[in-house]
Interface confidence: medium
């Protein structure tokens, strides 16, 4: 029977700057059944919090609602774990929620083939920023990726959109069924996962772009 | 050293305006959302207002609201309350307060206070 | 009328135990922390609790605070000369979008 070991705080992510979640890998519990408590300070601030939330993210989890998220200060957080033999403490972790946003994947991906008569014929991509995420406050630029692929095929052709919320493929093989996704970046922050995949068939007399 | 020093207070007739200031020192002002808090000599305290780091969101006790506006300078370090429609349930000891960090925390920082006569 | 409920006074002789309650409801204290401060006579308030049960560097451990459900309530143990003073509860109260206060209870040490 022996302390707890180091714990390790190994992620935090916030879907949109206003919540925030992290999570923590426990050390070996020293076979004795071991409490884990996150405590956190702001940068500038002298008192020293405990976690508000250990429900929200799951197991081995901390998370800070909207009342207790800051975007303009500096997280410092530390997990400690105890047993009937003692502490031990995670190395401290610095957290800057601009930094760690992970945003849901985009949302309503359409995919239609346009056949124009005067111009060549090209598939049309549409979708919607996350619902948490609010554009109109110009705290955010969303960029996002496309990537599509033939049914069969192992590899994707990845196009990258910007901040557009549409985009129009030329080069496709006729008589294919594609597979369309769509994710999201915040400009700091990490991609999103990718959008379910929307499938549409090319029809056979679709012309390939010189 | 966190310093928070209030003025303008004095004797105001009822129906009359008055503006207080609040100069603060020793931190980064505009890291930090504002309050004022007032004190009925004697008597409790009542929160009065609260604006944030910006100034982009302000709020009020529903015994001020419409009569008084809360705001502040960032070039200045200064937060102000203006205060108009003065009734004599408004006269008080007026503190400006400083948040420990993004609201809501508790206030650990707080001026000597300044006195409104109604 | 405040919007927290505090008995107005409390007293204690030197070194016994004495507490002081804070009665709210789910919008302010049942769903966010309590804070309690300390007012010396004549002089600005202080914070003496926060997060319902921690102590700010500086203030004795003699004074603990805890809450359930929609009531808290301040320890004051070893009762000493100097802790007389009026103390308040506070919360942030999500129904009204502002801070509420308790009326104060003024701690009287025999």
């Known amino acids: 029977q022996l302390p707890p070991g180091k714990p390790e705080i190994f992620k935090c992510r916030s879907p949109n700057k206003e919540t925030f979640t992290c999570w923590w890998r426990p050390g070996t519990d020293g076979g004795l059944p071991t409490n884990y408590s996150l405590t956190y300070h702001r940068e500038g601030e002298t008192l020293m919090h405990e976690c508000p939330d250990y429900i929200t993210g799951g197991p081995n989890s901390c998370h800070f609602g909207k009342q207790y998220t800051s975007m303009w200060r500096t997280y410092i957080m530390m997990v400690n774990a105890t047993n009937q033999m003692g502490s031990s403490f995670s190395d401290e972790l610095y957290v800057d929620v601009t930094y760690i946003v992970q945003p849901d994947p985009p949302l309503e991906l359409a995919v239609e083939v346009k056949q124009p008569e005067d111009r060549k014929p090209y598939l049309w991509i549409k979708w919607s920023p996350p619902t948490l995420i609010d554009l109109k406050t110009g705290w955010f630029t969303l960029l996002y990726e496309i990537r599509l692929k033939p049914e069969k095929a192992a590899e994707w052709e990845i196009h990258f959109a910007g901040q557009q919320t549409e985009f129009k493929i030329l080069s496709l093989h006729p008589g294919q069924k594609y597979l369309v996704q769509v994710r999201c970046k915040p400009d700091h922050g990490y991609w999103s996962a990718w959008s379910p995949a929307t499938f549409i068939q090319i029809p056979s007399d679709f012309t390939m772009n010189d | 050293e966190v310093q928070l020093l209030e003025s303008g207070g004095g004797l105001v007739q009822p129906g009359g305006s008055l503006r207080l200031s609040c100069a603060a020192s020793g931190f980064t002002f505009d890291d930090y959302g504002m309050s004022w808090v007032r004190q009925v000599p004697g008597k409790g305290l009542e929160w009065v207002s609260l604006?944030?780091?910006?100034?982009?969101?302000?709020y009020y006790a529903d015994s001020v609201k419409g009569r008084f506006t809360i705001s502040r300078d960032n070039s200045k370090n200064t937060l102000y309350l203006q205060m108009n429609s003065l009734r004599a349930e408004d006269t008080a000891v007026y503190y400006c307060a400083r948040p420990s960090g993004a609201y809501p925390t508790p206030f650990d920082n707080w001026g000597q206070g300044t006195l409104v006569t109604v | 009328q405040s919007v927290l409920t505090q008995p107005p006074s409390a007293s204690g002789t030197p070194g016994q135990r004495v507490t002081i309650s804070c009665s709210g409801s789910?919008?302010?204290?049942?769903?966010?922390?309590v804070y309690w401060y300390q007012q010396l006579p004549g002089t600005a308030p202080k914070l003496l609790i926060y997060d319902n049960n921690k102590r700010p560097s500086g203030v004795p451990d003699r004074f603990s605070g805890s809450k359930s459900g929609t009531s808290a309530s301040l320890a004051i143990s070893g009762l000493r000369s100097e802790d007389e003073a009026d103390y308040y509860c506070a919360a942030w109260d999500d129904s009204l979008s502002g801070w509420v206060f308790g009326g104060g209870t003024k701690l009287t040490v025999l």
């Open positions: 604006i944030s780091w910006d100034g982009g969101s302000t």
């Open positions: 789910t919008s302010n204290i049942g769903s966010n922390y």
